[in-house]
Each structure stands twice: as C-alpha cells, then as structure tokens.
C-alpha cells in the first residue's frame, strides 16, 4: 500500500508535515512550533 | 474487560501446518494493530508477526518469513496465523498481543498492553 | 537490525531491596527526544504483562515501586522495594517502527 501522505493527503497538513502510521493505516500531523489542530490549521 | 483467547494449538510433524486463532473481545479490535509473540519452553519472548488494524500492513522476522502468514477478520474480532513448513525451532507458546499506543503531535508509540493465555505448539516427528 | 541485551540475566535479591535492570540497545531507539523502549514482567506458565512504556510512563494498576528510566541506548527498570509478587522474569522490548520488535533476553529475579 502506497503512503498516503505522498497521494491523496499530499496537502492535508496546512503547517506540519504529513506522517502516516502504518500500524493505524492512519494519517495524522506533526505540526510546525505554535501550531496545532488535526490539520496544524490552528495557531 | 479486554480478553484475548488464543486456540489451534497442537502436536504437528515437521513440515506440516497449523492455523492458530485469537478470539478478541471488550474492546474495539479494529481500531487495533495486533501481533504474535511467541516462547520456546525455556526461552524467551520472540515476535513472530505484526498486522496493521485494517490488514494492509504485515510484517515478519526472518525466521517465520515466507512460511507463517497473519491475518485478521474485524467483523469476526479474530486474529489468526497460519504456520506452514513448521520446523522443530518453532516450537512454543504463541501468544496473541494487542498494540496498545499513544498518538500525539505526530508521535505515535505503541507496546504489547493486552495479551492472552497463549497455545502451545509442538512440532515433533 | 536492533539487538536488546540485558543485564544481570539473573538476579538474587530480598524482600525490601532496591533493585536495578539494565538494558541496552545495539543502536538508538529514540526519535526527536521520545523512547520506544517497554517494559514487561512474566511470572511462571503465565503471560506476560506490561509493566512501563516508552521509557518512563507506568501501566495502568502497576505499582509505583516500579519506575524506568534512560534514552538513547542505556535503559534502567528499578523496583524501589520488592515485594513477594515481583519475583518474575523482566524482559525489555524496543517498539521503533521499523521491525523486528526485538526483546531482550529476560532477567529472571529470585529470592535470595
């Protein structure tokens, strides 16, 4: 299975980068310092 | 109450198969990577497979790769392992293990929080 | 891959001791300040049972007499004052993401 954070989720992030967790099958944020949010969206 | 309760244990001659089953239950198995681990009378803990919650992800040490295959049914909450060309090495207590985890700020740690009785395997002629 | 060694491999203590397990990893298992090392104890014909993870964070209804420590390579399991119960095997485990999930080789702890 293709990451996809380089596919579909290639732009999900807004201030962070993009990780997918194989073992979850799922996508989630690491933010950039002062942000945060499920998308690091917020300040 | 997380339980997890491992069948399919047995005697088998080397090079035989065995297909060993963990039934899951007071917990929502498909939100769950799980795994097998295993123990040589005597020994120590060996991992022998790792499934993602949804099944696209497996993962294998050597010794068991190529000959076991993890697989998963989440409608069912069961975790299975199917062991073909068993060897006398693989002789063991296999355990089912549920990856219990933490996920915050990108970080994402897990650890074998949840286990069962085990079932034994006894591969002898 | 990572190689998980442990020592003593095994250990004479008494009730009331303070005792210190050691484990070492052949190379890091840290990522940006956080461990991927856990802790778990097995008594006889039983499962094992997680004791501490990533490091330093004690499991849920594991007494506090248990505490872990370290980073990088270097790992310490200590157990304040041991009680009767704990007399088991401690085995530590690396959960990185990249497999194999190794183990260490356990320390069986006995009464003196």
């Known amino acids: 299975k293709k990451n996809p954070c380089n596919a579909e989720f290639q732009n999900f992030c807004i201030h962070g980068e993009c990780k997918y967790i194989e073992h979850l099958e799922a996508v989630t944020c690491k933010c950039q310092q002062e942000y945060f949010g499920e998308r690091c969206g917020e300040k | 109450e997380v339980q997890l309760v491992e069948s399919g244990g047995g005697l088998v001659k080397p090079g035989g198969s065995l297909r060993l089953s963990c039934a899951a239950s007071?917990?929502?198995?498909?939100?769950?990577?799980m795994s097998w681990v295993r123990q040589a009378p005597g020994k120590g803990l060996e991992w022998v497979s790792t499934?993602?919650?949804?099944?696209?992800?497996?993962y294998y040490p050597e010794s068991v790769k190529g000959r076991f295959t993890i697989s998963r049914d989440n409608a069912k909450n069961s975790l299975y392992l199917q062991m073909n060309s068993l060897r006398a090495e693989d002789t063991a207590v296999y355990y089912c293990?549920?990856?219990?985890?933490?996920?915050?700020?990108?970080?994402?740690?897990?650890?074998?929080?949840?286990w069962g009785q085990g079932t034994l395997v006894t591969v002898s002629s | 891959d990572i190689q998980m060694t442990q020592s003593p491999s095994s250990l004479s203590a008494s009730v009331g001791d303070r005792v210190t397990i050691t484990c070492r990893a052949s190379?890091?298992?840290?990522?940006?300040?956080?461990?991927?090392l856990n802790w778990y104890q097995q008594k006889p014909g039983k499962a094992p049972k997680l004791l501490i993870y990533?490091?330093?964070n004690l499991q849920s209804g594991v007494p506090s007499r248990f505490s872990g420590s370290g980073s990088g390579t270097d790992f310490t399991l200590t157990i304040s004052s041991l009680q009767p119960e704990d007399f088991a095997t401690y085995y530590c485990?690396?959960?990185?993401?990249?497999?194999?999930?190794?183990f260490g080789q356990g320390t069986k702890l006995e009464i003196k």
């Open positions: 485990q690396q959960s990185t993401e990249n497999p194999p999930y190794t």
């Open positions: 190379q890091s298992v840290d990522y940006e300040g956080h461990s991927f």
């Open positions: 499934i993602s919650t949804g099944g696209s992800h497996t």
């Open positions: 990533a490091a330093s």
């Open positions: 007071g917990f929502t198995f498909s939100s769950y990577a």
């Open positions: 293990a549920r990856h219990g985890y933490l996920l915050y700020e990108g970080y994402y740690e897990w650890y074998f929080d949840y």
